[in-house]
Interface confidence: medium
């Protein structure tokens, strides 16, 4: 990466403008403040890739760091990063402005850090002090980030001298945290509510004799303050516990709501955060995905699963072919719905030991005042094949035919095989596959039915075998997405007199 | 009065060559930022390219980039865009736009506008 | 790139009355360090250029009618007629200018009722 000018510190005139150029082999963005400003992105004919950050009437506020990086920096060596510190010095701007968290330094442990007052001038004398105090404290000062050191739990102000005016920055405050020194738990009756609803929560301390709360709300930046209720839980030594009631919420007051807890003997303090969703109206919304199709085994245990969110605590019923399903007192059927969450349920419904009637359409329907939703699917009851039939026969034609009947759903396959060395087969020989068109010696006729009441197929299957010359095992096989059914007959010969 | 007048707009064919010039008037022409935009038929605005005020810096839509050139000429007062190896999708008015911006080179708006120029290309 | 997309493609408003222009772009068009927000508003009549009617989103252009204003922030922009004129039938376009590729809306073509 090149950048123009190469820095790595610029001191820049307020009010001027000032143009910075970043340019690489693959696409380069400027950022400043952990946000892309507007830029402008070029390639050149020689495939170089340029981005031109134009800083116009500069203003103190511009003073910090500027960074050129590749645009995807996916696979990049991390040193693919170029740092500019620009300084704009102005006398109308201090102590450049600090986000609200910088003001505050937790630790939990001792080690250095950095109380980050910065001005837009490197010439300026800038001291650190106690709030309370006039002395400088012995801490050394970098311009472009602060004073480092190892700090006790105080707080801070930087002072400096622009012009004849002397300046002081925020305060910040260091606290070194003991984790285990304070335990706050925060919870709600509801985290979701619908508008005009109450939102109530709780925030309780254990272990503490005095301690000050501190709750923050949507409503209290807008500056509409509520005054939360403080008791103590008799039933438990030193539990004491802040109530904040919003009755009838407005969706305004969706959002984070924290508890800071402060205990001033040691000055250790907690907070805790929950979020607080208020909806217009109340909502029932499927998660996940069902299947339109779904299926059983017969005589096997089914649960079929539909989660939701729903808020307030929705009604949910379940139908077959439009009819409602309940408990039934045999133990057949089964219903549940479980709340797995404060809005997420889980509905199940159970077959117990499936029946073919069991096969239909199934609906679960989860509705309340507000919305409603509802989610269908098909039941197939499988069905393991069997063989219900296999027999031969001698037709006055010659040849010899054997028929195979079975039944199962889904729709059996068929296979027939046959085995011509009776001692060897099928341990040592592999049976040879029958029906096939190419095989001239014997022809294959099939006929499917689907038996509307047991909801199964039935399938025929006839083999005409032309000329049996020596015993054969006929072997024919059902097989379907559940199971598969074997058997086996012997043909002989028309000229031999018994059959094995 | 700011005026902006395209001229050079033709009917080519596929493959083929043209070059836009946009005669300035009203402005200081070398303190400007300027830009060709184009318009298909009943469709909407698409930007083409930009040039910097030094005309140091070039910026080119994906759709054109390699195949126009937009230059500037500070001392005539002029903007060109040269446009080779013309497609059947380069059909369109091409307009001639002053930027807001004054600097080498910043992210700005189109404030004044020329009339547009016709640019056919077709066998 | 950045995407701009309007809504609805096409309106009907009876003189007089309010029109309404949306644009959404597919990432934030707010800088924070200026707190602008990259967005400008062009008017195109048949057979004319395009106009400027509003720039950092909520800008009038020196000429512009006050019955037009822009709003919006960060990544949903809005563009009001506050009182419709006959003269006012046009398409209008948004675009954004926080970096190359600059990209306009699809266009917005406004007639009245």
């Known amino acids: 990466l090149v950048v123009t000018p190469p820095g790595p510190e610029l001191v820049l005139n307020v009010s001027s403008t000032f143009v910075l150029t970043c340019s690489g082999s693959a696409p380069v963005v400027w950022e400043r403040m952990s946000q892309e400003p507007p830029q402008e992105m070029a390639k050149a004919q020689d495939g170089t890739f340029s981005s031109v950050l134009t800083l116009t009437n500069l203003t103190g506020l511009d003073t910090g760091e500027y960074f050129c990086t590749h645009n995807d920096s996916r696979g990049l060596e991390t040193d693919e990063r170029k740092r500019l510190y620009i300084f704009v010095p102005d006398p109308t701007v201090g102590f450049l402005p600090n986000d609200a968290e910088e003001l505050f330094i937790f630790l939990t442990e001792i080690t250095e850090i950095t109380i980050p007052c910065r001005v837009t001038d490197p010439q300026l004398v800038v001291t650190l002090h106690e709030k309370k105090g006039d002395v400088a404290l012995p801490v050394p000062y970098d311009h472009q980030r602060g004073f480092s050191g190892i700090f006790e739990d105080r707080s801070y102000i930087c002072k400096t001298t622009i012009g004849d005016r002397e300046v002081d920055s925020d305060a910040y405050y260091v606290y070194r945290l003991q984790v285990s020194s304070i335990n706050v738990s925060v919870n709600a009756v509801q985290t979701v509510v619908r508008q005009g609803e109450n939102i109530t929560l709780m925030c309780i301390v254990i272990g503490n004799e005095v301690v000050n709360f501190e709750w923050t709300y949507p409503r209290k930046e807008s500056g509409r303050l509520v005054e939360p209720v403080t008791d103590f839980l008799l039933d438990m030594p030193y539990h004491i516990r802040s109530i904040l009631h919003i009755p009838s919420a407005e969706l305004e007051d969706s959002g984070t709501y924290t508890c800071n807890v402060t205990e001033s003997v040691n000055d250790h303090q907690d907070e805790k955060a929950i979020n607080i969703t208020v909806v217009e109206s109340g909502y029932v919304r499927l998660l996940g995905e069902v299947g339109t199709l779904q299926f059983a085994e017969l005589h096997r245990s089914r649960t079929l699963q539909v989660v939701f969110e729903a808020y307030p605590p929705p009604t949910v019923l379940w139908f077959k072919d439009n009819r409602t399903l309940g408990d039934s007192s045999a133990g057949e059927i089964a219903l549940s719905t479980r709340n797995v969450s404060e809005t997420r349920y889980v509905s199940e419904l159970t077959l117990v030991r499936v029946k073919v009637a069991e096969a239909g359409h199934y609906t679960m329907r989860a509705f309340h005042e507000d919305a409603e939703v509802q989610l269908s699917f098909q039941l197939q009851i499988n069905v393991p094949v069997r063989v219900l039939e296999l027999s031969e026969s001698h037709p006055d034609s010659g040849e010899q035919t054997v028929r195979c009947r079975g039944r199962g759903m889904p729709q059996p396959n068929i296979i027939w095989s046959a085995c011509r060395d009776l001692k060897r087969c099928p341990r040592e020989l592999p049976p040879t596959l029958l029906g096939n068109s190419s095989e001239e010696e014997s022809q294959l006729e099939t006929n499917v039915t689907y038996w509307e009441e047991e909801q199964e197929f039935e399938v025929v299957s006839t083999l005409r075998l032309q000329h049996v010359d020596r015993p054969l095992s006929v072997r024919c096989t059902l097989r379907n997405a559940v199971g598969q059914d074997t058997q086996e007959v012997i043909v002989v010969p028309h000229s031999l007199p018994f059959k094995v | 009065e700011v005026q902006l007048l395209e001229s050079g707009g033709d009917l080519v064919q596929p493959g083929g060559s043209l070059r836009l010039s946009c005669a300035a008037s009203g402005i200081t022409f070398s303190s400007f930022a300027m830009s060709w935009v184009r318009q298909a038929p009943g469709k909407g605005l698409e930007w083409v390219s930009t040039v910097s005020v030094s005309a140091g810096i070039t910026y080119y839509a994906d759709s054109v980039k390699g195949r126009f050139t937009i230059s500037r000429d500070n001392s005539k007062n002029t903007l060109y865009l040269q446009m080779n190896s013309l497609r059947a999708e380069d059909t369109a008015i091409y307009y001639c736009?002053?930027?807001?911006?004054?600097?080498?080179?910043?992210?700005?708006?189109?404030?004044?506008w020329g009339l547009g120029t016709l640019v056919t290309v077709s066998s | 790139d950045i995407v701009m997309t309007q809504s609805p493609e096409s309106l009907a408003v009876s003189l007089g009355e309010r029109a309404t222009i949306n644009c959404k772009s597919s990432?934030?068009?707010?800088?924070?360090?200026?707190?602008?927000?990259?967005l400008a508003w062009y008017q195109q009549k048949p057979g004319q250029p395009p106009k400027l009617l509003i720039y950092?989103?909520?800008t009038r252009e020196s000429g512009v009618p006050d019955r037009f204003s822009g709003s919006g922030s960060g990544t949903d922009f809005t563009l009001t007629i506050s009182s419709l004129q006959a003269e006012d039938v046009a398409v209008y376009y948004c675009q954004q200018y926080y970096g190359t590729p600059y990209t306009f809306g699809q266009g917005t073509n406004l007639e009245i009722k």
């Open positions: 990432q934030n068009i707010l800088y924070r360090s200026n707190n602008k927000n990259y």
């Open positions: 736009a002053k930027s807001s911006c004054t600097t080498n080179s910043c992210p700005a708006y189109f404030d004044y």
């Open positions: 950092w989103a909520s």
